[in-house]
């Protein structure tokens, strides 16, 4: 080093990647979702990619149809293995209605509270999986805005199976589920042709969720 070398200013160290995320998965459990084991297979493949723990990523699951159930809270399990066991046991609760706005709003207001394990200053992520237009569509815009106001990153997944089986147009449905996703939509919205195809998006979805850790 040259004798004239001197430190003129100090550079802040490169920020470490945070491994902390609070993720709530919001599952449509209405009767039109079939087969349910395709949903549990999707959960299994997604969750086994996560480093779950009280100081790492936490995961909670909410299921909705006509009403909403907290399957488990963010702080319920402290390892990936425990969460995988619990997720496999989630039973489809059914219902003839798809109250997506209610599901999302309940996740925001309840699942992301400190009482249920949400951590201050930790990035909030919501993954919404549904196969049909919501029956409470009129509430959706406000519910999404409330999530936006609370900086909840949203990934939405549209399962087109029921529409394809009924030869119905998917246009309105896709439009609705796209509206749920955070911007940019093309990075936060997914659609699959049928329930069994859910597992095919796990790798990409996982990568995009983990990319949030670095931001």
């Amino acid at each position: 080093v040259s004798p004239t070398f001197q430190v003129v200013n100090s550079i802040a160290p490169v920020q470490e990647c945070s491994t902390q995320l609070d993720i709530v998965i919001v599952l449509d459990g209405s009767n039109s979702i079939y087969p349910w084991d395709s949903v549990t297979a999707f959960l299994n493949d997604l969750l086994e990619r996560m480093d779950i723990g009280p100081k790492q990523t936490q995961v909670g699951i909410v299921q909705y149809g006509e009403n909403v159930t907290h399957e488990f809270n963010l702080n319920k399990y402290s390892s990936t293995e425990e969460v995988l066991v619990a997720a496999k046991k989630i039973v489809q609760r059914g219902g003839r209605q798809t109250m997506t706005a209610l599901g999302i709003d309940t996740a925001r207001k309840e699942a992301f509270t400190e009482a249920r394990g949400a951590r201050r200053g930790v990035k909030k992520v919501m993954v919404i999986v549904t196969d049909g237009e919501s029956h409470d569509n009129h509430r959706l815009k406000k519910v999404i805005q409330d999530c936006e106001d609370e900086n909840i990153q949203r990934f939405s997944i549209a399962i087109l199976g029921s529409y394809n089986r009924g030869n119905l147009s998917t246009e309105k449905f896709v439009e609705e589920i796209k509206s749920i996703a955070s911007e940019p939509t093309e990075k936060h919205f997914f659609n699959v042709s049928d329930e069994l195809a859910l597992v095919t998006i796990v790798k990409t979805l996982g990568e995009r969720i983990f990319a949030l850790e670095a931001t």
Partner: antibody, heavy 125, light 107 residues
């Protein structure tokens, strides 16, 4: 009325691959899940796996590594391949349709396997 | 996986009698996804009941299903000669599994 017919060799050598086809007549293969089930002589029923008309599949975790399923919508057929067979795979193999009905719009109600093939006996020897 | 246990293994009854078959699941099953099948020797199974209690098309009303959660029952109110067969329950909410079967035989 939808009818299903299984076809394939009745005898397969150990370690080889069992291949069966199910032909759907009297209706379209589209928009349904289609399953394979087997039954060893004098025993109960075991689900092997299912294929959707789009080609998506899932299968029994205990057989997953050996099972391949596919669908040919042009021929109205779906097929099963089971690799590395042993004598324990000797059974009657059935194909079946997973039935559903619509309540309204896209709300379909599933009701299990409503149409079955008559079954085909496969012996591994 | 969800294990289904059927009892009794064999039921010996006379025509005209009432048959009650039980199916117990190792964990809760959505009642939307429990079915009953009848199988006669040399034949494929036939769907009798779906959604725990709904009769499939063409099934006579002497067959009825009930139950929820982990306990389900198939009842045949008055046995006809053609009802003597093996009966299987099946759950189709989480990777299809079948019970071991109950054989209803003539006493």
């Amino acid at each position: 009325q939808v009818q299903l017919q299984e076809s394939g060799p009745g005898l397969v050598k150990p370690s080889e691959t069992l291949s069966l086809t199910c032909t759907v007549s009297g209706g379209s293969i589209s928009s349904h899940y289609w399953s394979w089930i087997r039954q060893p002589a004098g025993k109960g029923l075991e689900w092997i796996g299912r294929v959707y008309s789009s080609g998506s599949t899932n299968s029994n975790p205990s057989l997953k590594s050996r099972v391949t399923m596919s669908v040919d919508t042009a021929k109205n057929q779906f097929s099963l391949k089971l690799s590395s067979v042993t004598a324990a795979d000797t059974a009657v193999y059935y194909c079946a349709r997973e039935g559903y009905d619509f309540w309204s719009d896209y709300y379909n109600y599933y009701y299990g396997m409503d149409v079955w093939g008559q079954g085909t006996t496969v012996t591994v020897s | 996986e969800i294990v289904l246990t059927q009892s009794p293994g064999t039921l010996s009854l006379s025509p005209g009698e009432r048959a009650t078959l039980s199916c117990r699941a190792s964990q809760s099953v959505s009642s939307s996804y429990l079915a009953w099948y009848q199988q006669k020797p040399g034949q494929a199974p036939r769907l009798l009941i779906y959604g725990a209690s709904s009769r499939a098309t063409g099934i006579p009303d002497r067959f009825s299903g009930s139950g929820s959660g982990t306990d389900f029952t198939l009842t045949i109110s008055r046995l006809e000669p053609e009802d003597f067969a093996v009966y299987y329950c099946q759950q189709y909410g989480s990777a299809f599994t079948f019970g071991g079967g109950t054989k209803v035989e003539i006493k």
